[in-house]
């Protein structure tokens, strides 16, 4: 069985302020089981953008139906983009662990740049 890969196909995405940004991410396998999370930035100071398991993320919607048992698409859309949203976004697969899930593999990242709103 091939080891799971996290694929973020776009290195960069540019969006006008006020629009929505779609950040694409796909897995090549569902194994090992565990949640997907999206972060802005890397390292200890990274910001959680979306957690498949829990939490309320009002500006984030998933592009595909994550409750499908065979879903491999973990792309997200972030609404009402502002310049403060600029940065590099990472799609990260965790494997289940106790008491805490363990980071298993990260995508290469997608850099989001924000253009000025057209006048």
């Amino acid at each position: 069985e091939d080891e799971l890969q996290v694929i973020q196909p776009e290195k960069s995405v540019s969006v006008a302020a006020g629009e929505s940004a779609t950040l694409r991410c796909a897995m090549t396998s569902l194994i090992p089981v565990g949640p997907i999370m999206w972060f802005r930035g890397a390292g200890a100071g990274r910001e959680l953008i979306y957690n498949q398991k829990e939490g309320h993320f009002p500006r984030v919607t998933t592009v595909s139906e994550l409750t499908k048992r065979n879903n491999l698409d973990f792309s997200i859309s972030i609404s009402n983009i502002t310049p403060a949203d600029a940065g590099t976004y990472y799609c990260v697969k965790f494997r289940k662990g106790s008491p805490d899930d363990v980071e298993f593999k990260s995508g290469a990242g997608t850099e989001l740049s924000v253009r000025a709103k057209p006048s």
């Epitope: 569902l30 194994i31 090992p32 089981v33 949640p35 498949q52 398991k53 829990e54 139906e65 994550l66 409750t67 499908k68 048992r69 065979n70 494997r95 289940k96 106790s98 008491p99």
Partner: antibody, heavy 118, light 107 residues
């Protein structure tokens, strides 16, 4: 409070059909996958089928595949189980259950009894 | 198939462990369900291996390692008498499976 209420059970003859319903309240039904689980008299729990939140994806155990169909109507906050070609082995209490993000169960209904007898 | 003991017994205040084996740790999440009488609604006491619903007492805990999951009741009470079912969700097959159930008797 999350509430799941099954209905539609009853006594039917072998070969007949029955449609079970599960009315959901207290949560955003359209955001959750759902399942049907049954318990035959004197037996343990048996998962039958699960359906994704939007209703486009369904899975079944082999013993009911082709006979049972799980469906949902998110506008009515309702889950259904259409059961065809029933046999005595389908006699059981049927529960609907809400799925967690990883397809286990967190809330259950009280169940509805289906009896298949000639 | 998931395998669990048919029965366990304990005195009030003792610690009870119920094991459930047969799943692949890398592809399986486990849950535990309490049923106080046949045909009554099951109650979820643990899901996602070790997550306890907010309305379940803290004496219930769960863990998983290797090919087995364990439900632990620390300081068991008479009202914990029930049948406990383990269940697994397998991410390879997309199928849920239940164990045959363990009858807990509190002496």
């Amino acid at each position: 409070d999350v509430q799941l209420v099954e209905s539609g059970g009853g006594v039917v003859r072998p070969g007949e059909s029955l449609r079970l319903s599960c009315a959901a309240s207290g949560f955003t039904f359209s955001s959750y996958a759902m399942s049907w689980v049954r318990q035959a008299p004197g037996k343990g729990l048996e998962w039958l089928a699960g359906i994704s939140a939007g209703g486009s994806d369904a899975y079944y155990i082999d013993s009911v595949k082709g006979r049972f169909t799980i469906s949902r109507d998110n506008s009515k906050n309702s889950l259904y189980l259409q059961m065809n070609s029933l046999t005595a082995e389908d006699t059981a209490v049927y529960y609907c259950a809400r799925e967690t993000w990883n397809h286990l169960f967190d809330y259950w209904g009280l169940g509805t009894l289906v009896t298949v007898s000639s | 198939a998931l395998t669990q003991p048919a029965s366990v017994s304990a005195n009030p205040g003792e610690t009870v462990k119920i094991t459930c084996s047969g799943g692949d740790w890398y592809s399986t999440y486990y849950g535990w369900y309490q049923q106080k009488s046949p045909g009554s609604a099951p109650v979820t006491v643990i899901h996602s291996d070790d997550k306890r619903p907010s309305d379940i007492p803290s004496r219930f805990s769960g863990s998983a390692s290797g090919s087995a999951a364990t439900l632990t009741i620390t300081g068991v009470r008479v009202e914990d008498e029930a049948v406990y079912y383990c269940a697994g969700y397998d991410g390879r097959t997309y199928i849920n499976t239940f164990g045959a159930g363990t009858t807990l008797t509190v002496l």
